[in-house]
């Protein structure tokens, strides 16, 4: 029978002859050299050589365990002579024993971690890992040990497991951002002779917010012309915040001063300033500077920095308005005047009056726009406004004037301002009542006395304020006639009567009556009409049949007698 | 006075790409937020992408149609916005406008003459 | 993501009339985040009120916007021949969005 053990062999033999692996031997072997051994499998006859006499084993070659920690081979004792078998074929192993030849490996030749600036003491980082390709099972050469050879006093490194941890109290990202931390993984657990290998551990510090907005300055002055439309930014100012991204975003509100209502402030979303807005429309004339608090805050604070105080700081804004020439004002929207239609040329109405708004209280003149007063019936005072008239009037042609009246600053005629003027022309009792058309009548030569042929009415272009009352009489030449009279009704009609019994149309065919009508208006107007009246021929009804004398030669024919 | 001049539209096949470029003047460019903006032949508006300013990272952002295929890049040196298409689709098909946003970097103030993209077989 | 709609999403209106359009976001946002537009055909749309009531320069005194929270609106006093546009609205929260648009037309 075969008479060995496994074979051992230390690795990275670096001796100058064969290494000795072992020997081969058969019990059947009386050294006389009769029998023959023989070695195949894994590198035999090349790696692995055999004295086929004494069956001892050497290796030809430095061996690495890493690289193949066991090779397994067949042995075979032959009868030299006849070349059969004195032992079965028997397999075998020759195992590679381990030296520590190897040093740790990080798995990374460089890593990126980040931890957020101020974590407590402790907080993970990040575990980096080096692995050895000595034999784990057998010695220290591939047991691993951690330690940090920078990066101290910030970070720490667990000596098992790799992981790194911060080791220092309020590490602040504004102060120092970026670390970089060399680790050193040492195999023999870390022993005298130990190998050894180091990675580079890059460590950003990610933001907190644990910096509140700061203005840099206490106080900002801006100026905006009055005229400025609501909505105009007029000025920028910016806290500074050392924190970044979403922690360094800033709101802006005003939260106190006297342009609380006239001012905004809202926050450019892209370069975080605050920009003062107009809200409502100024008046330089009404208030020349405004203070306004701003309030700079952060919108996303960490309740655990709470303690360093608020995160918000203030500064005053000052704002100039600044003075815009504004045309001159008047005051009222539009005038309404009235005058006498009766008014002599150059009489007063009445006045209009403008300002300059301005602090400066520009003189002002007036003018009349002579586009709305063609006929140049009005005129005004340029200096103090004043109204009147340079033609005389007539309300009955004109009602009401309206005309533009512009006043302008004298000391710069840019500036100027229109307002309507309404004239009423007030009514004089200056026209006298007519008839209200042409009266032309008719009575039936068989007419009885008394009998009403015609009622008369009048019109007057006047408006006095209580009405129109009319009074009619006969003209004087006309009343004492004995044909006709006249009846005035008392309701600004009168009726034409007849004054006797049948009447002769060949005697006389027509007849033409005065009639005075007069109103009671002050000064009384009166004027006269005539009222013709034909004699006709009528049937049995008194509808008329013929008006025409059969000889209506003679001029004696036509009488105004009544 | 503010401009915006968009360039580089036309015709385009059903997966292809194209290239779209605003020349930006008339006011400080790297203070500004940039975006695109569509509108299909007798549609509505539609917000296309968004860059941001240098300080904001040039922080991108897009319409969930166009993300993956579109992105949106500036050039501050040249004061121009680009907008790169690919894998172009029909409904893509629209007149885009490069627009800036008012003060403050609100609202879409101001916008350019548009460009028609048309992606047709 | 923010929507917005608008409406009516068309109207008929004559001139000199006083002319309401709505906008209603599904969740509240900041008057300063709410903008409202006027575009006519073929034409780039125009600021017309920015940060819920401001006037965009330029932009006539008849128009106005007002509201918080979730409904803003835009107000046209008088209506003039070249309000005739369609206009939306449109908030600042990424993703941006705008309203459908609300066409307004002649009567």
């Known amino acids: 029978s075969w008479m060995w053990n496994q074979f051992f062999l230390l690795e990275e033999y670096t001796g100058s002859d064969y290494q000795y692996v072992g020997k081969l031997h058969s019990d059947q072997d009386r050294g006389d050299g009769s029998l023959k051994y023989i070695l195949s499998g894994d590198g035999a006859g090349d790696l692995f050589i055999i004295n086929e006499n004494t069956g001892d084993i050497q290796a030809t070659k430095r061996l690495d365990r890493e690289e193949k920690p066991v090779y397994i081979l067949r042995a075979q004792a032959v009868n030299r002579r006849t070349g059969r078998p004195v032992e079965p074929e028997s397999e075998f192993i020759i195992k590679i024993h381990d030296i520590n030849d190897n040093e740790p490996i990080f798995t990374k030749d460089v890593y990126t971690a980040t931890v957020p600036e101020m974590a407590d003491v402790g907080t993970f980082v990040v575990q980096v890992t080096a692995t050895d390709a000595d034999d784990p099972t057998y010695g220290n050469s591939a047991k691993v040990v951690y330690s940090i050879l920078q990066g101290q006093p910030y970070f720490s490194v667990e000596s098992e497991t790799g992981i790194i941890k911060t080791a220092l109290l309020n590490m602040d990202r504004e102060n120092r951002e970026q670390y970089q931390v060399v680790i050193q993984a040492k195999d023999m657990g870390g022993q005298m002779g130990g190998l050894s290998g180091t990675t580079t551990v890059n460590i950003t510090l990610t933001d907190v917010n644990d910096n509140p907005p700061r203005f840099p300055q206490s106080t900002y002055q801006f100026k905006t012309p009055e005229s400025s439309p609501p909505g105009t930014p007029i000025g920028r100012i910016k806290a500074s915040d050392a924190d970044v991204g979403e922690n360094a975003e800033i709101e802006y509100s005003i939260t106190d001063g006297e342009g609380h209502e006239m001012f905004d402030v809202i926050t450019d979303q892209e370069t975080q300033e605050g920009i003062i807005t107009v809200k409502k429309l100024l008046d330089f004339e009404k208030k020349k500077v405004y203070t306004l608090k701003v309030e700079a805050s952060n919108p996303h604070v960490e309740p655990r920095f709470l303690y360093l105080g608020p995160f918000k700081d203030s500064a005053t804004v000052r704002i100039v308005v600044d003075d815009v020439d504004e045309p001159p004002v008047f005051s009222k929207l539009a005038y309404i005047l009235q005058i006498r239609e009766d008014a002599r040329i150059n009489t007063t109405i009445g006045s209009v009056a403008a300002q300059d708004p301005d602090a400066a209280r520009n003189p002002v003149k007036y003018s009349v726009d002579r586009h709305t007063d063609m006929d140049r019936i009005f005129n005004i005072d340029s200096g103090n406004g004043s109204i009147f008239t340079s033609k005389l009037l007539d309300r009955e042609t004109l009602l009401w004037h309206n005309i533009t009246v512009i006043a302008t600053e004298i000391n710069n005629p840019k500036q100027s301002s229109r307002v309507p003027l309404y004239i009423k022309v007030l009514d004089v009792n200056d026209n006298a009542p007519e008839f209200a058309e042409f009266y032309e009548t008719f009575v039936c030569e068989k007419a009885k006395a008394d009998q009403l042929i015609q009622t008369l009415r009048a019109v007057d272009k006047d408006d006095p304020y209580s009405g129109h009352q009319f009074s009619f009489s006969l003209a004087p030449e006309a009343a004492s006639s004995s044909n006709f009279t006249i009846q005035d009704n008392k309701d600004n009609t009168a009726g034409i009567l007849t004054r006797k019994n049948g009447y002769n149309r060949h005697e006389m065919s027509t007849y033409l009556l005065p009639v005075v009508i007069s109103d009671n208006d002050y000064p009384v107007q009166s004027s006269t009409g005539t009222v013709t009246v034909r004699v006709c021929a009528c049937d049995h009804h008194g509808n008329m049949q013929s008006c025409h004398a059969e000889a209506l030669i003679h001029p004696t024919g036509l009488s105004t007698g009544a | 006075e503010v401009q915006l001049v968009e360039s580089g539209g036309g015709l385009v096949q059903p997966g292809g790409s194209l290239r779209l470029s605003c020349a930006a003047s008339?006011?400080?460019?790297?203070?500004?937020?940039m975006n695109w903006v569509r509108q299909a032949p007798g549609k509505g508006l539609e917000w296309v992408a968004r860059i941001r300013i240098k300080n904001n990272n040039y922080a991108t952002y897009y319409a969930d149609s166009v993300t993956d295929r579109f992105t949106i890049s500036r050039d501050d040196s040249k004061n121009s916005l680009y907008l790169q298409m690919n894998s172009l689709k029909t409904e893509d098909t629209a007149v885009y406008y490069c627009?800036?946003?008012?003060?403050?970097?609100?609202?879409?103030?101001?916008w350019g003459q548009g460009t028609l993209v048309t992606v047709s077989s | 993501d923010i929507q917005l709609t608008q409406s009516p999403s068309s109207l008929s209106a004559s001139v000199g009339d006083r002319v309401t359009i709505t906008c209603s976001a599904s969740?509240?946002?900041?008057?300063?985040?709410l903008h409202w537009y006027q575009q006519k055909p073929g034409k780039s749309p125009k600021l017309l009120i920015y940060?819920?009531?401001y006037l965009a320069s330029g932009v006539p005194s008849r128009f106005s916007g007002s509201g918080s929270g979730t409904d803003f609106t835009l107000t046209i006093s008088s209506l003039q021949p070249e309000d005739f546009a369609t206009y939306y609205c449109q908030q600042d929260i990424v993703p941006l969005t705008f309203g459908q648009g609300t066409k307004l037309e002649i009567k």
């Open positions: 940060r819920s009531f």
């Open positions: 969740s509240s946002i900041s008057s300063h985040y």
């Open positions: 627009v800036r946003p008012d003060y403050g970097n609100y609202g879409l103030a101001y």
């Open positions: 008339g006011f400080t460019f790297t203070t500004y937020a």
